[in-house]
Interface confidence: low
C-alpha cells in the first residue's frame, strides 16, 4: 500500500478555493523527489496539472500552485476559482505519475444555492449553536414573532412567540424577544443536526405589513483533520468542543464500515479492549478540552476518529464533534522493539525503549499505564533519577545503548509488576511506545542472598550465582542509587578458555567490600550484559551495623582448601551478621567459594568473576 496519504474526498462550491494537503514519509529521497497533482482520465492515465518542479497546466494557470514542506513530509496543492468542470478524480503523489507512490483524491465542486435576495447565510458545525437574527418594524413589535422552515414550496412552523415549538426542535430552541426599543428578535438553536440544514423565514406580524427575513442555515459535518503517523509510534487527538459541553461526558470513537461509531474510550470508563495498555484520555481543562493519546500504533488503527460530548459517552446526533482521519505509515522511522517482555517472579526484565535519535539530550521517562477510568501513566523513573519510592532498589533507567535507544531495568519482579509500561521523552511525542511485561512460571537465573547485614570495618563478600548460558556474558556488580547503578570496579575474569567448557551447574561473580563503611549500606545489583545490551539482574540489600563486642559467635567460612570437585556438606552456611544462616534453596548442590576476607591491595569494593573450581583461598 502506498505510504502517501491525503484527503479522500474534497468538496467545495463554485468560485471558492481548496487547499489539499498530502503526506509522505520524510526520507531523504522523498523530501527531494518530484511532487505532483494529476487528474485521472478515462484511459486511466493521470495528466499532471501542477508539480513541484514549476510545471502548471494551462487549465490551472494563474489559479493553482504546489508547495513542498520537506521538513514536515507534506506538500500542499492550492486551487482557486473552482468551477463545476474541476469535479473529478485526482492523485497527489511522488516521483513519476504511474509509479504508485500516490493517493487518490475525489474533488466535487457543486453549484452554490440560489438564494432569495437579502438572505443571511449562517454556516455552523453540527452540534454547535446558531443565533438567527430577525429584524422587525415598530408597528409589528406587539405582534406574533415566528420562525418557519421552507421545505419545497411549503413553510413549516418551527417556533413562535405563542410558545409553540416544533417537536423536531424540542428542548433545543428558544425565541428571544428583547425589551422595548430594540427592533430585533432572535432564535437560538442548540445542538444543530444535519437535518436542520436549509432555508428559514423569520416573520413578525401578519398580512401585508408583516416583516420577513430569509436565513440560509448550512450545517456542516466537521472536515476531518488528516493525521499521518508512523507504525509503532504515537498519536495525540486534541479535542476542543467548547465551554457549553465542559461538564458533559466526553468520548473518542472510530467510524466503522456501517458508518456508526464504536467507542474507543470515554470519560465514563468505557475502553475498547484493542487499545488496552496503549491509550490515555488526559483529564480535561477548565474549557472542556481534552486529549487522547494512543501509542504502539498498528496498521489496523487507521480510520476516521470522532471526539464528542454526550451524557451517554457516545456519539449522538446534534452534539458537537471533531474529526480526524488517521493514516499509519508502514515505512516507519521507529525501530521494531519487543512489545511483550517476559520475566519470572523474583527475576528481572531489561526493556529497550526507542527515542528519536536526533534528541539524544532529551529527558527519558518510563511510566506504568493504569487502566482505571480514563487511564493514567504515573512516572516511575526518569533519566535524572527515580520518581516512585516503592521502586527503590529495583528500577533503573540507563542511557545505554544510546543512539536512539535507552534501557530500563526492573528486578525483584512480582506478579503485580505485570502490565503495560510506556517509554517516553520530553521531546518528540510521536516516539512514545508501549511494552507489556508478563510474569511467567520459572526461576530467576541469577541468585543472590536474600538480605545481607555487613559489619562496620570488616570484609563483606556477596556471591551471585549464574548459569552456564551466561558464561560468555560480561558480569558486573553495581551499587544502585536513584540516579542509576554505578558499576563497581571489576577484577580480571581470568583466561577466556575458562568459559569455553561450561559443565558446572552455575558459576558466580562475587562482590567484596573491604572494609565496610556506613556509605556501603544500600541496594546492590548483580547483572549480566553483552556490550551495551543489558540482560538479567538480581538485587540484594546490604544493611550495615556496628561491630558487636561481647557474646558474638563466629562461624568460619567453608574450608578454602577443599578439593575442586568436593561438595561441601554445609553449603548453606554464609557469614552474615556473624551468625550461621541456612539457605538451602540458594546454595544447595552448589560449590562454595571461600573468602578469607583480606584483600591484597586493590580497590575497596571489588568484583570477582570466576568459575568456582578456579577460585583460590583468598580474594583476587
Amino acid at each position: 500500500k502506498s505510504p502517501v496519504f491525503g484527503p479522500q474526498e474534497v468538496s467545495s462550491v463554485e468560485g471558492n478555493s481548496v487547499s489539499i494537503k498530502c503526506y509522505y514519509p520524510p526520507t531523504s529521497v522523498n523530501r527531494h523527489t518530484r511532487k505532483y497533482w494529476c487528474r485521472k482520465g478515462a484511459s486511466g492515465r493521470c495528466i499532471t496539472l501542477v508539480s513541484s518542479e514549476g510545471y502548471v497546466s494551462s487549465n490551472y494557470a494563474g489559479r493553482a500552485n504546489l508547495t513542498n514542506f520537506p521538513e514536515n513530509g507534506t506538500f500542499v496543492v492550492n486551487i482557486a476559482q473552482l468551477s463545476r468542470d474541476d469535479s473529478g478524480h485526482y492523485k497527489c503523489g511522488l516521483g513519476i505519475n504511474s509509479r504508485g507512490l500516490s493517493f487518490d483524491v475525489s474533488l466535487e465542486v457543486s453549484q452554490g444555492p440560489e438564494l432569495p435576495n437579502g438572505t443571511e447565510v449562517y454556516t455552523v458545525d453540527v452540534g454547535r449553536t446558531v443565533t438567527i437574527k430577525c429584524p422587525f418594524k415598530t408597528e409589528n413589535a406587539p405582534k406574533t414573532k415566528a420562525l418557519y422552515k421552507k421545505i419545497g414550496q411549503t413553510s413549516v412552523l418551527v417556533i413562535d412567540s405563542r410558545n409553540y415549538v416544533n417537536p423536531n426542535y424540542k428542548d433545543r430552541i428558544r425565541l428571544r424577544i428583547p425589551g422595548t426599543g430594540q427592533l430585533i428578535f432572535t432564535v437560538v438553536i442548540d445542538r444543530l443536526r444535519l437535518s436542520d440544514h436549509g432555508l428559514y423565514l423569520c416573520q413578525a406580524g401578519d398580512g401585508s405589513n408583516r416583516d420577513e427575513k430569509n436565513a440560509d442555515l448550512q450545517v456542516l459535518e466537521p472536515e476531518p483533520e488528516l493525521v499521518y503517523e508512523d507504525l509503532r509510534g504515537s498519536v495525540t487527538f486534541h479535542c476542543a468542543l467548547g465551554l457549553e459541553v465542559a461538564n458533559v461526558a466526553k468520548f473518542l470513537c472510530r467510524v466503522n464500515s456501517r458508518e456508526t461509531c464504536d467507542v474507543v474510550i470515554n470519560t465514563l470508563g468505557k475502553r475498547d479492549s484493542a487499545f488496552e495498555g496503549r491509550i490515555l484520555l488526559n483529564p480535561q481543562d477548565k474549557d472542556g478540552s481534552f486529549s487522547v493519546v494512543i501509542t504502539g500504533l498498528r496498521k489496523e488503527d487507521e480510520g476516521r476518529y470522532l471526539c464528542g460530548a454526550h451524557s451517554d459517552g457516545q456519539l449522538q446526533e446534534g452534539w458537537p464533534i471533531q474529526a480526524w482521519q488517521l493514516f499509519v505509515n508502514e515505512e516507519s522511522t521507529i525501530p521494531r522493539s519487543p512489545t511483550v517482555v517476559k520475566g519470572v517472579a523474583g527475576g528481572s526484565v531489561a526493556v529497550l525503549c526507542p527515542y528519536n535519535p536526533k534528541e539524544s539530550q532529551s529527558l527519558k521517562y518510563w511510566c506504568l499505564w493504569e487502566g482505571a477510568q480514563n487511564g493514567r501513566c504515573p512516572l516511575l523513573v526518569e533519566s535524572q533519577g527515580l520518581v516512585q519510592e516503592q521502586y527503590e532498589g529495583r528500577l533503573s533507567l540507563l542511557q545505554e545503548p544510546g543512539n536512539g535507544t535507552f534501557t530500563v531495568i526492573l528486578n525483584q519482579l512480582t506478579t503485580q509488576d505485570a502490565g503495560f509500561y510506556w517509554c517516553l521523552t520530553n521531546g518528540d511525542t510521536r516516539w512514545r511506545t508501549t511494552v507489556e511485561i508478563k510474569i511467567i512460571e520459572g526461576e530467576p537465573n541469577l541468585k543472590v542472598p536474600g538480605n545481607v547485614t555487613a559489619v562496620l570495618g570488616e570484609t563483606l563478600n556477596i556471591p551471585c550465582h549464574f548459569p552456564c548460558k551466561f558464561s560468555s556474558y560480561e558480569k558486573y556488580w553495581c551499587k544502585w542509587s536513584n540516579t542509576g547503578c554505578q558499576t563497581l570496579p571489576s577484577q580480571d575474569e581470568g583466561p577466556s578458555e575458562a568459559f569455553v567448557n561450561c559443565d558446572e551447574n552455575s558459576r558466580l561473580v562475587s562482590l567484596t567490600l573491604n572494609p565496610v563503611t556506613r556509605a556501603d549500606e544500600g541496594w546492590y545489583w548483580c547483572g549480566v550484559k553483552q556490550g551495551h545490551f543489558y540482560g538479567e539482574t538480581a538485587a540484594v540489600y546490604v544493611a550495615v551495623e556496628e561491630k558487636k563486642v561481647a557474646g558474638s559467635r563466629y562461624v568460619s567460612p567453608a574450608k578454602a582448601d577443599a578439593a575442586p570437585d568436593e561438595k561441601v556438606l554445609d553449603s548453606g552456611v554464609r557469614e552474615i551478621e556473624n551468625k550461621a544462616i541456612q539457605d538451602p534453596r540458594l546454595f544447595a548442590e552448589e560449590k562454595v567459594v571461600a573468602d578469607t576476607g583480606d584483600q591484597a591491595g586493590g580497590s575497596r569494593a571489588s568484583v570477582d568473576s570466576s568459575s568456582s573450581e578456579e577460585q583460590g583461598g583468598s580474594s583476587k
Partner: nanobody, 125 residues
Framework: QVQLVESGGGLVQAGDSLRLSCAAS??????????MAWFRQAPGKEREFVAS????????YYADSVKGRFTVTRDNGKDTVTLRMNSLKPDDTAVYYC????????????????WGQGTLVTVSS
C-alpha cells in the same frame, strides 16, 4: 459494580478503642488501584472526611479532629481497609462510611466515586 461493606461499629465508652473494617468486592480492577477513605456523618450534621490512604498505602491523610488518635491502613491482599480508632470521644459518635476513588489527593476533598452503606459508632460518656 463495586460493593463496599463496613463492619466493626458498636457502642463503646469514651476513651475506648474500636476497629472498623471495609471489605471491597465486585471490582472491575484490582483493589490496589483504588485510593480509599473513611467519612462520617453525625446525627443532624453533614458527612465529613476522616482519613484517606493511597492505593499502595504509601501516603495517608487525616482530618485535624482525629489526627494522632485514628490510623488508616490497608491490606491489598485481602481487599480491605481498616480504621483503628483510639481514645474515642462522644464527638466521634456517627455513622462511618467507607469510600473509594480512582485517584488520591491530600486534604479533605477526597474524590469519592463509590460508597458503602455505613456502620454506626456510638461513644457514650
Amino acid at each position: 459494580q463495586v460493593q463496599l461493606v463496613e463492619s466493626g461499629g458498636g457502642l463503646v465508652q469514651a476513651g475506648d478503642s474500636l476497629r472498623l473494617s471495609c471489605a471491597a468486592s465486585g471490582r472491575a480492577l484490582s483493589f490496589n488501584t483504588y485510593a480509599m477513605a473513611w467519612f462520617r456523618q453525625a446525627p443532624g450534621k453533614e458527612r465529613e472526611f476522616v482519613a484517606s490512604i493511597t492505593y499502595n498505602g504509601g501516603s495517608t491523610y487525616y482530618a485535624d479532629s482525629v489526627k494522632g488518635r485514628f490510623t488508616v491502613t490497608r491490606d491489598n491482599g485481602k481487599d480491605t481497609v481498616t480504621l483503628r480508632m483510639n481514645s474515642l470521644k462522644p464527638d466521634d459518635t456517627a455513622v462511618y462510611y467507607c469510600a473509594s476513588a480512582q485517584y488520591w489527593r491530600s486534604g479533605t476533598s477526597f474524590p469519592a466515586n463509590y460508597w458503602g452503606q455505613g456502620t454506626l459508632v456510638t461513644v457514650s460518656s
